[in-house]
């Protein structure tokens, strides 16, 4: 009996540019002889319904149809037919099929590969055209994929023990697609600093499928001047 097992749940998520290993394990009732078996990996794009051969291994012959694709013969002996793809790109997401032949038996398994890119986040202060005591803080999130993203603003006042979500005076622009397929978006918070308590911490909170925990960028209102420090104006921080 020949059986193939892929990633549990049927989906693998990998960061953009990562060296990804797409799992495929072979279960066979006898010891595997790699000279008399075959492995073929196929890929089906998210946009086209056409299957493309990525890699094949037959006895003493192996060929990568995608540059850098490899199945380790050494690991194959112990039943690991996982495919390694260096520098994975967004357009390489889709369905991967691992087909194993141990004559006369054949088994296969499929897995969905999702490629994600984590956003970078930075805060900027824009005082151009603003009234006195009015500031506009911009939270720029860039280089993320997929497009779905959630940006919120929160504040933590001195006296209260937990943050408060801000819903007023927040405008989040449309997402903009970059040349590389990733996305950018900017969210703006308008503050009347004269009405806010010094010591209040404001935070732009970015939630995205690529992040285990939200990305946070903050600034604190000071009594002297309600603004970001010079380093905060230009640096990325989370």
């Amino acid at each position: 009996d020949l059986k193939v097992e892929m990633m549990a749940g049927g989906t693998q998520i990998t960061p953009l540019n990562d060296n990804v290993t797409i799992f495929c394990n072979i279960f066979y009732s006898q010891p595997l002889n790699i000279t008399s078996m075959g492995i073929t990996w196929f890929w089906k794009s998210l946009t086209f319904d056409k299957e493309v051969k990525v890699f094949e291994f037959f006895g003493d012959h192996q060929e990568a149809f995608r540059p850098g694709a490899i199945v380790s013969p050494w690991r194959l002996k112990s039943g690991d037919a996982s495919l390694r793809l260096p520098g994975i790109q967004l357009e390489e997401a889709g369905e991967y099929r691992c087909e194993v032949v141990v004559t006369p038996l054949k088994a296969q398994g499929t897995v969905q590969l999702e490629v994600v890119a984590s956003p970078a986040s930075r805060l900027l202060l824009d005082q151009v055209g603003m009234k006195e005591n009015e500031d506009k803080y911009m939270c720029e999130s860039s280089g993320f994929y997929p497009e779905a993203i959630n940006i919120t603003w929160e504040k933590q006042t001195q006296k209260f023990p937990h943050p408060i979500e801000i819903s007023e005076d927040v405008i989040t622009g449309p997402t903009i697609k970059n040349m590389d397929g990733t996305f950018n978006v900017t969210s703006c918070l308008k503050l009347n600093s004269s009405q806010e308590d010094p010591g209040t911490v404001y935070q732009c909170v970015v939630r995205h499928a690529s992040l285990h925990t939200p990305l946070r960028s903050n600034f604190t209102l000071t009594a002297a001047r309600h603004s970001l420090s010079e380093t905060e104006k230009t640096d990325n921080f989370s």
């Epitope: 933590q156 209260f160 937990h162 408060i164 010591g199």
Partner: antibody, heavy 117, light 107 residues
Framework: QVQLVQSGAEVKKPGASVKVSCKAS????????MNWMKQAPGQGLEWMGG????????DYNEKFKGRVTMTVDTSTSTVYMELSSLRSEDTAVYYC??????????WGQGTLVTVSS | DIQMTQSPSSLSASVGDRVTITCKAS??????VAWYQQKPGKAPKSLIY???NRYDGVPSRFSGSGSGTDFTLTISSLQPEDFTTYYC?????????FGAGTKLEIK
């Protein structure tokens, strides 16, 4: 990292006073507000009051007003909560706590005050 | 003062169960509600703020929902370490007030 270390357990007689301390470290002391909570044995949590750590502002729960005093010693980064005219229902664990800047609020380990004749 | 009425006061469940604890505020508190977990002899630990936002490091099995006067804390799949006491807290105004607590026990 932020630490709030409270003074040890106290046993007091009814009518006496108790002063519990909370020493803070790991952050700029004066730029925060410190709250005090009470938790009687097997009971829920109750806010007693709070103090701004530069010492210029306090806010007390009406229930404890007149009996509770909160003070600050900025030189030692220590906050004090004094409760006077103690009665048996004041037997509780007292906690100092401050906001956590997005990572959950910070709490001291608690101080058990037992009021018994 | 704003009263926070928490229910049930105790709850028996098994590992893997999904449980929901509710909290009702005596007046509109918006989303200014936090949830705490307290283990015996320890200080409370914040789980949720702004009714539904998990603090960093809090397992995803904990989720909060609600706004206005009705709030819930849900634990999607109970783990052995979750059997302890939970409190809700409003922080829209002083005095800060808490629910009376829900003790979660192993069935």
């Amino acid at each position: 990292q932020v630490q709030l270390v409270q003074s040890g357990a106290e046993v007091k007689k009814p009518g006496a006073s108790v002063k519990v301390s909370c020493k803070a470290s790991g952050y700029t002391f004066t730029s925060y507000w410190m709250n005090w909570m009470k938790q009687a044995p097997g009971q829920g949590l109750e806010w007693m009051g709070g103090i701004y750590l530069n010492g210029d502002s306090t806010d007390y729960n009406e229930k404890f007003k007149g009996r509770v005093t909160m003070t600050v010693d900025t030189s030692t980064s220590t906050v004090y909560m004094e409760l006077s005219s103690l009665r048996s229902e004041d037997t509780a664990v007292y906690y100092c706590t401050r906001r956590g800047d997005y990572f959950g609020d910070f709490w001291g380990q608690g101080t058990l005050v037992t009021v018994s004749s | 003062d704003i009263q926070m009425t928490q229910s049930p006061s105790s709850l028996s469940a098994s590992v893997g169960d999904r449980v929901t604890i509710t909290c009702k505020a005596s007046q509109n508190v918006g989303k200014y509600v936090a949830w705490y977990q307290q283990k015996p002899g320890k200080a409370p630990k914040s789980l949720i703020y702004s009714a539904s936002n998990r603090y960093d490091g809090v397992p995803s099995r904990f989720s909060g929902s609600g706004s206005g006067t009705d709030f819930t804390l849900t634990i999607s799949s109970l783990q052995p370490e979750d059997f302890t006491t939970y409190y809700c807290q409003q922080y829209i105004s002083y005095p800060l007030t808490f629910g009376a607590g829900t003790k979660l026990e192993i069935k």
